[in-house]
């Protein structure tokens, strides 16, 4: 392993369709991929009237957007699909939404000092 890089070997697995899909709702997914590629964990969820509904969690393939992210944080402002990815075993157990504020926004809108975490 490269020094400073958190290798991902397993991730929290969750499938919201578990009853329909008849797979276990929650588990630990071992991550595989090409030897020269990095592996990550991810979480994707919906926000329905302030209520968080996890869609799926599990392993994610080599993605530059996930490099060196130890926390699973969605930074897009009001995304259609909430998605985050990270590096490190089970790093997707907790995930958060912490939109990056644009400079043009009025200062009367306070920036949340810490991202709200869901798990």
């Amino acid at each position: 392993a490269i020094l400073g890089r958190s290798e991902t070997q397993e991730c929290l697995f969750f499938n919201a369709n578990w009853e329909k899909d008849r797979t276990n709702q929650t588990g630990v997914e071992p991550c595989y991929g090409d030897k020269d590629k990095r592996r990550h964990c991810f979480a994707t969820w919906k926000n329905i009237s302030g209520s968080i509904e996890i869609v799926k969690q599990g392993c994610w393939l080599d993605d530059i957007n996930c490099y060196d992210r130890t926390d699973c944080v969605e930074k897009k402002d009001s995304p259609e699909v909430y998605f985050c990815c990270c590096e490190g075993n089970m790093c997707n157990e907790k995930f958060s939404y912490f939109p990056e504020m644009e400079v043009t926004q009025p200062t009367s809108n306070p920036v949340t000092p810490k991202p709200p975490y869901y798990n």
Partner: antibody, heavy 120, light 107 residues
Framework: QVQLVQSGAEVKKPGSSVKVSCKAS????????ISWVRQAPGQGLEWMGG????????NYAQKFQGRVTITADESTSTAYMELSSLRSEDTAVYYC?????????????WGQGTMVTVSS | EIVMTQSPSSLSASVGDTVTITCRAS??????LAWYQQKPGKAPRLLIY???HLQSGVPSRFSGSGSGTHFTLTISSLQPEDFATYFC?????????FGPGTKLEIK
């Protein structure tokens, strides 16, 4: 790198059953997510069901519920798809396929396919 | 069951052209959409997953976009080996369903 090798072509009578095997080589078989997809001659692709061997339980498309059984034998790294009460419209190439991840990102490694012909 | 539709069902193009194939889902599938290429007598090949991620080893002239119910596959600077049939597939919920395919032919 995973490789999937399927059993040979079959000719079956209507009303009978067929069991197609799919032997995997490569990393830990029990951790794979395996699906079965079929394609009738000149037609599109149809997902039949899938299994994660470590969990054992399979899930099936409603269309095939009660007629298809997907199993996995960890000792031989082989997945099986059995289809019963065969009819002429079951004539197709049957593929076993590995998924990229358990969350079904995409079907990345395909077996060579097994042609099943149902004819009286 | 989520029904996938594709358009056009077939199209003719020349080497060097750029073509776009559209896939629609009968209900939202988030970004759980993959694209496959299939040549006669061969198994399909995964090109794109999660709507826009290029599968390892696939040339960068293939690109995907979209989310929810509307997705596109674009092939820029068509090469002779790109003439084939293309399928989309949703894996948001079972049964995972495929589009009927788009046949790309040489003009």
């Amino acid at each position: 790198q995973v490789q999937l090798v399927q059993s040979g072509a079959e000719v079956k009578k209507p009303g009978s059953s067929v069991k197609v095997s799919c032997k995997a080589s490569g990393p830990r078989f029990q951790d794979l997510s395996i699906s079965w997809v079929r394609q009738a001659p000149g037609q599109g692709l149809e997902w039949m069901g899938g299994i994660i061997p470590i969990y054992g339980t399979a899930n099936y498309a409603q269309k095939f519920q009660g007629r298809v059984t997907i199993t996995a034998d960890e000792s031989t790294s082989t997945a099986y798809m059995e289809l019963s009460s065969l009819r002429s419209e079951d004539t197709a190439v049957y593929y076993c396929v590995k998924d990229l991840t358990w969350t079904n990102l995409g079907l990345d490694i395909w077996g060579q396919g097994t042609m099943v012909t149902v004819s009286s | 069951e989520i029904v996938m539709t594709q358009s056009p069902s077939s199209l003719s193009a020349s080497v060097g052209d750029t073509v776009t194939i559209t896939c629609r889902a009968s209900q939202g599938v988030s970004r759980w959409l993959a694209w496959y290429q299939q040549k006669p007598g061969k198994a399909p090949r995964l090109l794109i997953y999660w709507a826009a991620h290029l599968q390892s080893g696939v040339p960068s002239r293939f690109s995907g976009s979209g989310s929810g119910t509307h997705f596109t596959l674009t092939i820029s600077s068509l090469q002779p080996e790109d003439f084939a049939t293309y399928f989309c597939q949703q894996s948001y919920s079972t049964p995972f369903t495929f589009g009927p395919g788009t046949k790309l032919e040489i003009k």
